[in-house]
């Protein structure tokens, strides 16, 4: 079973070489390269164990099959 992979940039803001620091009520999102609210954590139960490693996400298809890796 594969995981769809997204290239994500390093944890730095667009306008600075300093890593983005989020406050206690926020999470860093590498896709948007910014802090977002994460008071309500949301990980839908898809019946799969999804790694939250940077750039990795499971992508269920019909029948909960997974798509192969995409570079």
């Amino acid at each position: 079973m594969g995981a769809r992979r997204l290239r994500v940039r390093s944890q730095r803001s667009r306008d600075s070489s300093v890593p983005t620091q989020c406050n206690q009520t926020e999470c860093f999102d590498p896709l948007v390269r910014n802090c977002v609210s994460c008071e309500l954590f949301h990980t839908p139960d898809t019946g799969h164990t999804s790694s939250l490693e940077p750039g990795t996400a499971l992508q269920p298809q019909e029948g909960s099959a997974l798509r192969p890796d995409v570079a």
Epitope: F28, V36, H42, T43, P44, D45, T46, L52
Partner: nanobody, 121 residues
Framework: EVQLVESGGGVVQPGRSLRLTCAAS????????MYWIRQAPGKGLEWVSY????????YYADSVKGRFTISRDNSKNTLYLQMNSLRAEDTAVYYC??????????????WGQGTTVTVSS
């Protein structure tokens, strides 16, 4: 079962508009941040836009800024992407994706099946 069903794709001429819709079910849509992510033919995935659960925070990729508008209707469990001034380079499969957060970071979670947008004259 978590389901995301995209619609609204099609063939359109450059400069025209399309509106993509994502119908969500099987989870609490109103508390989930959502992404639109696309994949052009033969290319990698590209994040397009993000909207927070309450629509208070919205981000766009530089390539679509000023042309695309993301929105959501939590009462209808629906996510939208209004695409204006379409270009050939917008041709791609567009995916509606949930946001999953944990350990201080957020990443894509569950993906829809995608809807194809083709911009061609």
């Amino acid at each position: 079962e978590v389901q995301l069903v995209e619609s609204g794709g099609g063939v359109v001429q450059p400069g025209r508009s399309l509106r993509l819709t994502c119908a969500a079910s099987g989870f609490t849509f109103s508390t989930s941040g959502m992404y639109w992510i696309r994949q052009a033919p033969g290319k990698g995935l590209e994040w397009v836009s993000y909207i927070s659960s309450s629509s208070s925070t919205i981000y766009y990729a530089d390539s679509v800024k000023g042309r695309f508008t993301i929105s959501r209707d939590n009462s209808k469990n629906t996510l939208y992407l209004q695409m204006n001034s379409l270009r050939a380079e917008d041709t791609a499969v567009y995916y509606c994706v949930t946001q999953s957060c944990g350990a201080g970071k957020c990443y894509p979670g569950v993906w829809g099946q995608g809807t194809t947008v083709t911009v061609s004259s």
